[in-house]
């Protein structure tokens, strides 16, 4: 699943280039283990102003199939409570480009940790 | 008013193939994701499939995967679900069904059609 | 996948009466993103599923507010205030946060 998410932020990717969205978004560069699925949440978040802003359907389809991915490879543990983590409101702004780099980051600590 | 007009339902033998049609109207039917829910004859409902908007995702639970393919054609605002290998287990009443975004809206299914019958028996 | 349970299988009421139908899933439903998508489906005799009620509590357009959703977590329930001929029918719990989405066993209103 999450290999399939990785894809999928590459499609959304791919498909924003073409659009100049010049929004920024709460992003977390640093994301520390013990706050993985805070930061996830996050960024899942921050994917649907992504496919609100764009207008776009195969950015809404995508951001919802990759919402679907993380949900289910998260069901078992994404109602952890992670204690001391940042609020999405307190991280960095950044371009989408830098968002959608660090969402990879944070996909690929999930990937290790299976 | 939104319309769902599901067809294509009958008797087939196990093993055999089927496939539904739902017809759309009354709504802009690429603006959504559609589903096909059936019903058992103990009258228990289960989820079949989904899709999204534009077709390039799809969703099965493990009972129909491999065996069901839903599709859509949105210059003809029709759904479709092509069934094969099918078993007893699989007769029931087949709605389709529109979804209601999960970014915009609540993620339900806000209309269903009337429902299309198939029966697998020998 | 997520199992849910629905009580009770049939619910006798007389018109006018509140009823209350309970669904209960066998994890949290709620998702990543802290949405719990839990609806409540009636479907009245020879007629399709319709919409009642989404996100654990939203009334559908169109549905009267004796229809009232809450819970949260893993235990929903549904009231209907005051019972109505028109309510009587088959009630559906669904989740679908997370993939197989599945339905409750349905509980049959009818008159006592």
């Known amino acids: 699943n999450w290999v399939n998410v990785i894809s999928d932020l590459k499609k959304i990717e791919d498909l924003i280039q073409s659009m100049h969205i010049d929004a920024t978004l709460y992003t977390e560069s640093d994301v520390h283990p013990s706050c993985k699925v805070t930061a996830m949440k996050c960024f899942l978040l921050e994917l649907q102003v992504i496919s609100l802003e764009s207008g776009d359907a195969s950015i809404h389809d995508t951001v919802e199939n990759l919402i679907i991915l993380a949900n289910n490879s998260l069901s078992s543990n994404g109602n952890v409570t992670e204690s001391g983590c940042k609020e999405c409101e307190e991280l960095e702004e950044k371009n989408i480009k830098e968002f959608l780099q660090s969402f990879v980051h944070i996909v690929q600590m999930f990937i290790n940790t299976s | 008013e939104v319309r769902l007009m599901a067809s294509g339902g009958g008797l087939v033998k196990p093993g055999g193939s089927l496939k539904l049609s739902c017809a759309a109207s009354?709504?802009?039917?690429?603006?959504?994701?559609m589903s096909w829910v059936r019903q058992t004859p103990e009258k228990r409902l289960e989820w079949v499939a989904t899709?999204?908007?534009?077709?390039?995702?799809?969703y099965y639970p493990d009972s129909v995967k491999g065996r069901f393919t839903i599709s859509r054609d949105n210059a003809k605002n029709t759904l479709y679900l092509q069934m094969s290998s099918l078993r007893s287990e699989d007769t029931a009443l087949y709605y389709c069904?529109?979804?209601?975004?999960?970014?915009?809206?609540?993620?339900?299914?806000?209309?269903w059609g009337q429902g299309t019958s198939v029966t697998v028996s020998s | 996948d997520v199992l849910m349970t629905q009580t009770p299988l049939s619910l006798p009421v007389s018109l006018g009466d509140q009823a209350s139908i309970s669904c209960r899933s066998s994890?949290?439903?709620?998702?990543?993103?802290?949405?719990?998508?839990l609806e409540w489906y009636l479907q009245k005799p020879g007629q399709s599923p319709k919409l009642l009620i989404y996100?654990?509590?939203n009334r559908f357009s169109g549905v009267p507010d004796r229809f009232s959703g809450s819970g949260s977590g893993t235990d929903f329930t549904l009231k209907i205030s005051r019972v109505e001929a028109e309510d009587l029918g088959l009630y559906y719990c669904?989740?679908?946060?997370?993939?197989?989405?599945?339905f409750g066993g349905g509980t049959k209103l009818e008159i006592k």
């Open positions: 069904a529109r979804r209601v975004s999960m970014i915009t809206g609540g993620w339900a299914m806000d209309y």
């Open positions: 009354e709504f802009t039917f690429s603006n959504y994701a």
């Open positions: 899709i999204s908007r534009g077709g390039d995702y799809t």
């Open positions: 994890q949290s439903i709620v998702d990543i993103t802290g949405n719990t998508y």
């Open positions: 996100k654990v509590f």
């Open positions: 669904f989740q679908d946060s997370f993939v197989p989405y599945t």
